[in-house]
């Protein structure tokens, strides 16, 4: 399929002008290469009429132009003073020859329609209302008024002042006078449908003294707005239907031959094919709304229509707006995993691509919710605090310049299953959808922390160990202190007098963190994790409680210690950084030699973890998982 896109059918009237926009993929080569407009001949040859190289054919001289808009990845062909001879098949395209990339366009130029003298032309869109003005002389002020529609030679009455209304105009047509006006009557026809188009005659009085006016009504199908989007990107349909339908249910549907299948409406209907990747946003009280679809697929290309009706379904005679969506498969958006799988108690690291030209943009991660219109509350962002209920288990790691950021979610529960969106406040095309599937764990987690009774005493030394399997042997291990603006990896060199170290026990694949001496500010969530360069892997979390040194301090149950996270005071939740100048972390690669497991510690951790789960609520278990 050619990545060039434009209008398939263009129609106009003799003497008028047309403007044809053609879209091309946003690449440097495409921006600079030759653009052309040629006419397809019967012999298969396409004769150039105009090109961006400056060529202009004789028949287009003085009436056509071709303008490239590289910033929009479009070029526009303007043709004026159209004649019926311009009717034909054309191509708009790119390349040094007319056999390059192109899109076929059919142009039809019709004769100017002929109407009886003094015919007033009314042009209205489907679903709208027309007001036909009928003038009469004073002599017919008290005579019967009527509006009829010409059908061949006959003229069938639509409505008259005796309150007759043709059944096909029932509840749609009204005849009225305005104020004190004695020389005009009006006929309103609402909810216009294509078959309403035609020639109307309004009349006041009977016989030769009657006053007659001709009105030609043209009912226009909505001209589809062309939307050119990359595969995996997102599209927004901005729908503005007007105040008159502000209180009616809204919908977006996709045309399918004769029908239009609803994709989403404000009454809660949603096509399963768009689950997790669609949002409908009411914009204001004037009937405006927008529908956002992310993760565009090849099969999403097609004709779309938005509308309003109390049923939330397409209805003839109600206003609509139309689009034609083209999905360019030559996408700049990288193909990332659309489904990520995790297990309860485990973690996931989700890589979110963004436009590399916008590394300073703010990054966000939201959870798509299937309420009636769909919504996506932001859970974390570069300038957004972690959503309540996700403290200690969610962090966003920006990797400037890499064109991606990573979101890590740990302490997974089955309730975390669902759809999530990666997005930035920059290029809105780069919105990707990920489905997270969390299954019940069937084995021990890869990372385990001991002790699970993580209570440190101020002024003393506190060591916590993270057990990892041999498969992580070659990966970098780290401890980080979680805060509301990320998880700050503990520094790997001494930046202060205080001893806080991370070391690995050669005999048992352990990476340990030591706080020495413990301070009140050390309280909070700590993560143990593995990574390879900027690729983050498994993590596990533990809440370290800090208490004053007291004689005969009671032993705190690990469940209680970790449950504090849920009720952590705001100051703790808001803590913004690890005191890097006072923490030291040493990860010595020489210490990762032995592949022996410590069975007992593992079994003990498993047992404690189970009790930790039992005492937690809302999937926010504080125990190390």
């Amino acid at each position: 399929q050619s990545p060039i896109f434009g209008p398939q059918d263009v129609s106009s009237i003799e003497g008028n002008s047309v403007s044809i926009t053609c879209y091309y993929p946003d690449t440097s080569v495409n921006r600079h290469t030759r653009k052309y407009w040629c006419r397809q001949g019967a012999n298969g040859y396409c004769a150039t009429l105009i090109s961006s190289n400056g060529y202009l054919s004789k028949e287009y001289s003085g009436r056509a132009s071709l303008i490239n808009f590289p910033e929009n990845s479009t070029f526009v062909i303007n043709i004026a003073h159209l004649t019926q001879e311009d009717t034909g098949s054309y191509k708009c395209g790119l390349g040094t020859t007319n056999r390059g990339l192109f899109f076929d366009v059919s142009l039809e130029v019709s004769q100017v329609p002929e109407f009886p003298n003094d015919t007033h032309v009314y042009t209205k869109d489907i679903g709208r209302t027309v007001t036909i003005e009928c003038r009469f002389k004073e002599g017919n002020a008290h005579s019967k008024k009527s509006l009829c529609k010409k059908r061949g030679e006959a003229c069938e009455v639509v409505i008259d002042s005796t309150e007759y209304v043709d059944p096909s105009y029932k509840d749609r047509a009204i005849l009225f006078m305005k104020g004190t006006s004695r020389d005009i009557f009006y006929v309103n026809i609402s909810h216009l449908i294509p078959s309403d188009a035609g020639l109307y005659v309004c009349q006041a009085g009977e016989g030769p003294s009657a006053d007659k006016n001709n009105a030609d009504l043209q009912v226009l199908e909505p001209e589809p707005e062309l939307l050119y989007k990359d595969l995996r990107s997102s599209v927004t349909f901005e729908c503005d239907l007007g105040r008159e339908v502000a209180n009616d249910a809204k919908y977006l549907c996709r045309k399918n031959k004769e029908t239009c299948d609803v994709i989403i409406n404000t009454l809660g209907k949603r096509d399963p094919a768009f689950e997790g990747r669609i949002l409908l946003t009411p914009r204001d009280d004037n009937g405006r709304f927008s529908v956002l679809i992310t993760g565009l697929r090849k099969e999403d290309a097609g004709h779309y229509q938005c509308g309003a009706h109390s049923s939330g379904l397409p209805q003839e005679g109600w206003p609509v707006q139309a689009w034609q969506l083209f999905v360019n498969e030559e996408s700049t958006i990288p193909n990332s995993r659309s489904v990520v799988k995790g297990v309860t108690g485990g973690s996931v690291a989700i890589v979110c691509p963004y436009n590399p030209k916008e590394s300073s943009s703010l990054k966000y991660w939201c959870h798509w919710e299937a309420d009636e219109n769909g919504r996506c509350p932001v859970l974390v962002g570069t300038q957004a605090l972690v959503q309540e209920g996700y403290e200690g288990r969610l962090a966003l790691f920006d990797q400037p310049g890499s064109g991606a950021y990573t979101v890590i979610l740990n302490q997974l529960t089955t309730q975390d299953s669902g759809f999530y969106w990666c997005l930035t406040d920059g290029d809105s095309r780069w919105r990707t959808t990920i489905e997270l599937q969390v299954a019940e764990a069937t084995k021990k987690p890869d990372l385990e922390v001991t002790p699970q009774n993580a209570t440190a005493v101020i002024g003393e030394t506190f060591t916590i160990s993270c057990h990892y399997p041999c498969k992580f042997y070659s990966q970098e291990k780290y401890w980080c202190k979680w805060s509301n603006d990320g998880c700050h990896i503990l520094p790997s060199h001494d930046e202060g007098a205080r001893q806080s170290s991370v070391s690995c026990d050669q005999s048992s694949q352990i990476v340990s963190m030591t706080l020495n001496p413990v301070k009140k500010e050390d309280e909070g969530w700590y993560w143990c994790g593995v990574k390879e360069g900027q690729v983050y892997g498994e993590t596990t979390a533990i809440y370290v409680a800090v208490e004053e040194r007291t004689r005969g301090s009671p032993h705190i149950n690990p469940t209680d210690a970790n449950a504090r996270a849920k009720d952590a005071p705001e100051e703790e939740a808001m803590e913004s950084s690890v005191r890097e100048d006072e923490n030291k972390a040493n990860l010595d690669p020489r210490l990762f030699a032995d592949e022996r497991e410590i069975q007992n510690a593992g079994d003990q951790a498993q047992e404690n973890r189970a009790s930790g789960n039992a005492g937690s609520a809302g999937g926010q278990s504080g125990s190390s998982k």
Epitope: L279, T281, L292, L362, Y364, C366, R375, C376, P377, V378, G381, Q383, A384, L385, Q387, E388, W421, L423, D425, E570, A573, M574
Partner: nanobody, 131 residues
Framework: EVQLVESGGGLVQAGGSLRLSCAAS????????MGWFRQAPGKEREFVAA????????DYADSVKGRFTISRDNAKNTVYLQMDSLKPEDTAVYYC????????????????????????WGQGTQVTVSS
């Protein structure tokens, strides 16, 4: 409920600058779109500037465009109004306002210049520009 406290007002000469701050209480600051309004003596309160909850979208009254800049620091629960090239007609009490929009993708770019759409208001800070 959020409490808003404005500061940074004062007396300044025409052509000078001031930076107003509005500190908000509570953890959910980043679920509010924020705005600045002002009221000159004997006049109606009028819109000055607004910023979306992400900080990614801003809007200004025509009279201050190019001179005033609104910004926010969600980590500090604070919204700022940098006022440069001040004119005597900028003299007014400046109010900070918050609109509850929720931290949602659908409200990422929402800013409002309409007084009635704001849910919480500060007490105001006086700005006087002398000629």
């Amino acid at each position: 409920e959020v409490q808003l406290v404005e500061s940074g007002g004062g007396l300044v000469q025409a052509g000078g600058s001031l930076r107003l701050s509005c500190a908000a209480s509570g953890r959910t600051f980043d679920s509010y779109a924020m705005g600045w309004f002002r009221q000159a003596p004997g006049k109606e309160r009028e819109f000055v500037a607004a910023i979306s909850w992400t900080g990614g979208s801003t809007d200004y009254a025509d009279s201050v465009k190019g001179r005033f800049t609104i910004s926010r620091d969600n980590a500090k629960n604070t919204v700022y109004l940098q006022m440069d090239s001040l004119k005597p007609e900028d003299t007014a009490v400046y109010y900070c306002a918050a609109e509850v929009v929720g931290r949602d993708v659908t409200t990422m770019y929402r800013v409002s210049g309409l007084e009635y759409e704001y849910d919480y208001w500060g007490q105001g800070t006086q700005v006087t520009v002398s000629s």
